[in-house]
């Protein structure tokens, strides 16, 4: 039998996926946005102002089992995926509403994983196997890059990342931190 | 069971281009990174280049930044090597590995790229 | 990224235990990254041994087992056999867990 599907802090529904998940569903239609962060509101205002220091983009974040063959994570991993185009940070927090989205007329601009941290997972397996310890690599931060017609997306052009950085103050090298760190967060993820 | 296949390599003069394959099967190709990594002939591992699971990020090694571009296509179960501007130093075996867990869990069985006038 | 470093050659006897080095910095192997180690035998491709410093992916033998002290990883095999014979290759990642290093390989021999 498979594993569960549970919940995120986003309100979809997740299957189980394996280390690394497809982008989710969310980011493709926005009936499962986390409401309380997206306010179902378009954007105020058109796009005007080319300051790259005002690029950021959307950061999700996403709640997840990691699974290995039959084995499953004890509890589930939380982390951020970056959400598609990039937009000015002023908009942001409407960017998306009703589906709405500010494209460039130019260049293509993504958001990207930036930071990765790593953490240790402890995989249950069934029938008695003994529990296998893992660690995975897990998206920190996002930035936005910029991506010309005449470039592959090999030669993305960081916009520089500080517009792009989780507001919660995460240090320059995010795997660095303890267990119970990383404990606290899957916590309050709930 | 997992597999990785590349395909590709072959005799280029400097200067040329090359495009290398990987073919993988036996696991969820799109729930995985994946690397390459090159062996000169006589000489040790190095890694060359890796991706993300969904293509969005890549990452180089500073040796071959800017003339190689790494791609797939979750679609074809398929990653690519872009090799451009390449140069003798760059002759070697090159494998693709499966980039899970932060170590490389299976390897292909490696293509012969060798780059000579 | 510098590379890890390792000594070129070890040997032991059939039945024998040896243990091969791999020295690295603060910033890689000494810091809460972990080490793998690769076997590979001449013409073949690499083979995951050990993960994680000192863990066994299913069906390598319980004759190889890792350690780390400080910016210093081990591989250690018990009980030499033949096939053993290789080049054996760790390996750590980088900072940003987005690269990796290698060490230069240790050739073992088998008398």
């Known amino acids: 039998q498979g594993w569960q599907a549970f919940k995120n802090d986003a309100t979809e529904i997740i299957p189980e996926l394996g280390e690394y998940p497809e982008p989710p569903p969310e980011l493709e239609n926005n009936k499962t946005m986390n409401r309380a962060e997206n306010g179902g509101r378009p954007p105020h205002h058109p796009f005007e102002t080319k300051d790259v220091s005002e690029y950021s983009c959307r950061e999700l974040h996403f709640t997840r089992y990691v699974t290995d063959g039959p084995c499953r994570s004890a509890k589930p991993v939380t982390e951020l995926v970056c959400s598609g185009q990039c937009g000015p940070a002023r908009l942001l927090p409407n960017a998306i509403g009703r589906g709405k989205w500010w494209r460039p007329s130019g260049p293509d601009f993504r958001c990207i994983p930036d930071r990765y941290r790593a953490q240790r997972v402890q995989l249950l397996c069934p029938g008695g196997e003994a529990p296998r310890a893992r660690k995975v690599r897990l998206v920190a931060s996002c930035k936005c890059k910029r991506l010309t017609r005449f470039h592959n997306q090999s030669e993305l052009k960081d916009f520089g990342t500080e517009a792009a950085r989780p507001q919660k103050g995460r240090k320059p090298r995010p795997r660095a931190r303890s267990a119970k760190a990383n404990q606290a967060e899957l916590e309050n993820a709930y | 069971q997992v597999q990785l296949v590349e395909s590709g390599g072959g005799l280029v003069q400097p200067g040329g281009s090359l495009r290398l394959s990987c073919a993988a099967s036996?696991?969820?190709?799109?729930?995985?990174?994946l690397s390459w990594v090159r062996q000169a002939p006589g000489k040790g591992l190095e890694w060359v280049s890796n991706?993300?699971?969904?293509?969005?990020?890549?990452y180089y090694a500073d040796s071959v930044k800017g003339r190689f571009t790494i791609s797939r296509d979750n679609s074809k179960n398929t990653l690519y090597l872009q090799m451009n501007s390449l140069r003798a130093e760059d002759t070697a075996v090159y494998y693709c590995?499966?980039?899970?867990?932060?170590?490389?869990?299976?390897w292909g069985q490696g293509t012969l790229v060798t780059v000579s006038s | 990224d510098i590379a890890l470093t390792q000594p070129a050659s070890v040997s032991g006897s059939p039945g024998q235990s040896i243990t091969i080095s791999c020295t690295g910095t603060?910033?890689?192997?000494?810091?809460?990254?972990?080490v793998s180690w690769y076997q590979q035998h001449p013409g073949k491709a690499p083979k995951l041994m050990i993960y994680?410093?000192?863990n066994r992916p299913s069906g390598v033998s319980n004759r190889f087992s890792g350690s780390k002290s400080g910016n210093t990883a081990s591989l250690t095999i018990s009980g030499l056999q033949a096939e053993d014979e290789a080049d054996y290759y760790c390996?750590?990642?980088?900072?940003?867990?987005?690269?990796?290093?290698f060490g230069g390989g240790t050739k073992l021999t088998v008398l």
């Open positions: 590995a499966r980039d899970t867990y932060l170590h490389f869990d299976y």
């Open positions: 036996g696991f969820t190709f799109r729930s995985h990174w």
């Open positions: 991706i993300n699971y969904d293509g969005s990020s890549t």
């Open positions: 603060s910033s890689d192997v000494g810091d809460i990254n972990d």
């Open positions: 994680d410093v000192n």
């Open positions: 390996s750590s990642y980088g900072e940003s867990l987005t690269s990796y290093v």
